[in-house]
């Protein structure tokens, strides 16, 4: 399995962001496909579970990403992307996308570095 991501993503505080992760595989995509998304915070704290897909999508039942993430992928199109809603500044960090598609061997885990930035104020727009 080979994984492709946007590597770097900038999004405005309070908005939603699509974390894009696509993949290629020698094996056909079927019921064995799994996708796991995790998050490594900027402060070096423990990695956190974000999302899981296996036949159906599954949100985390606890923690900061509860009720804030949804599946936006399409396995038949080799897309394992997710949507993260209502971005907060402490969502800054690295999101990892891990795709397993047996019997293909696991590939390198894809990474996206998300930067959540301030909403552009009207005065700043006027100044620009």
């Amino acid at each position: 399995v080979e994984i492709y991501t946007s590597r770097v993503l900038e999004a405005v505080n309070g908005t939603d962001a699509r974390l894009k992760c696509t993949f290629s595989s020698f094996a056909p995509v079927g019921d064995a496909l799994t996708v796991t998304w995790n998050f490594r915070p900027l402060d070096g704290g423990p990695e956190q579970f974000v999302f899981y897909y296996h036949i159906d999508p599954f949100q985390p039942m606890s923690g900061r990403f509860k009720d804030r993430v949804s599946w936006d992928g399409n396995p038949e199109r080799y897309d394992a992307s997710i949507l993260l809603w209502k971005l907060q500044f402490d969502d800054n960090g690295t999101y990892t996308c891990q795709v397993k598609n047996p019997p293909d061997v696991d590939g390198v885990i894809g990474e996206i570095r998300l930067s959540v930035v301030h909403t552009v104020r009207f005065s700043e727009i006027h100044f620009l």
């Epitope: 799994t34 915070p41 704290g45 039942m61």
Partner: antibody, heavy 116, light 106 residues
Framework: QVQLVQSGSELKKPGASVKVSCKAS????????MHWVRQAPGQGLEWIGE????????DYNEGFTGRFVLSVDKSSSTAYLQISSLKAEDTAVYYC?????????WGQGTLVTVSS | DIQLTQSPSFLSASVGDRVTITCRAS?????MYWYQQKPGKAPKPLIY???NLASGVPSRFSGSGSGTEYTLTISSLQPEDFATYYC?????????FGQGTKLEIK
């Protein structure tokens, strides 16, 4: 490194109350929800509930509503489990644990013994 | 609540053996966690979301499954693996644990 340090063992009489503390260090306290798990002597694990340290929001297992109260003190990065109207069947080890990719980090456990 | 039933409840095995523990759910769950617990100690995570190894866990541990049936496999038992193992589901609230499987030295 992440550490969860719990208060010491307690011996209480039926009907009394107990407050178990769990002091967190090595991570940003408000970034991870705190969970409490009970293990009666020689028995399995039961989830009591969870608390969001950012806003104090709680979610309890149905069997633990009423007498069990979770709280946090953000200033000291400490979580608390208070049990009121103690019964003999509350005798157990109580663990605090944070949810990361699983319940990855656990306190050492606090034995609460309820006996007359 | 979803009930999890582990089998076997007790298991005797020798160092080097391949061991499989099964966890059956009363209704379909999306994924499973596995923990190891030694006497007097807190549980330690082994597997998260069905098949992912927790940090620092040796590769002889593996997890698989879907729906109502999940398995934990230890490919070659080591002396330090003798302990009690618990499965846990969290694709529906409240999270629930299996009753445990005690793995003993034969």
């Amino acid at each position: 490194q992440v550490q969860l340090v719990q208060s010491g063992s307690e011996l209480k009489k039926p009907g009394a109350s107990v407050k178990v503390s769990c002091k967190a260090s090595g991570y940003t306290f408000t970034n991870y929800w705190m969970h409490w798990v009970r293990q009666a002597p020689g028995q399995g694990l039961e989830w009591i509930g969870e608390i969001n340290p950012t806003n104090g929001g709680t979610d309890y297992n149905e069997g633990f509503t009423g007498r069990f109260v979770l709280s946090v003190d953000k200033s000291s990065s400490t979580a608390y489990l208070q049990i009121s109207s103690l019964k003999a069947e509350d005798t157990a080890v109580y663990y605090c644990t944070i949810y990361t990719t699983a319940l990855d980090y656990w306190g050492q456990g606090t034995l609460v013994t309820v006996s007359s | 609540d979803i009930q999890l039933t582990q089998s076997p409840s007790f298991l005797s095995a020798s160092v080097g053996d391949r061991v499989t523990i099964t966890c059956r759910a009363s209704s379909s769950v999306g994924y499973m966690y596995w923990y190891q617990q030694k006497p007097g100690k807190a549980p330690k995570p082994l597997i998260y979301v069905t098949s992912n190894l927790a940090s620092g866990v040796p590769s002889r541990f593996s997890g698989s499954g879907s729906g109502t049936e999940y398995t934990l496999t230890i490919s070659s038992l080591q002396p330090e693996d003798f302990a009690t193992y618990y499965c846990q589901q969290w694709s529906s609230n409240p999270p629930t644990f299996g009753q445990g499987t005690k793995l003993e030295i034969k």
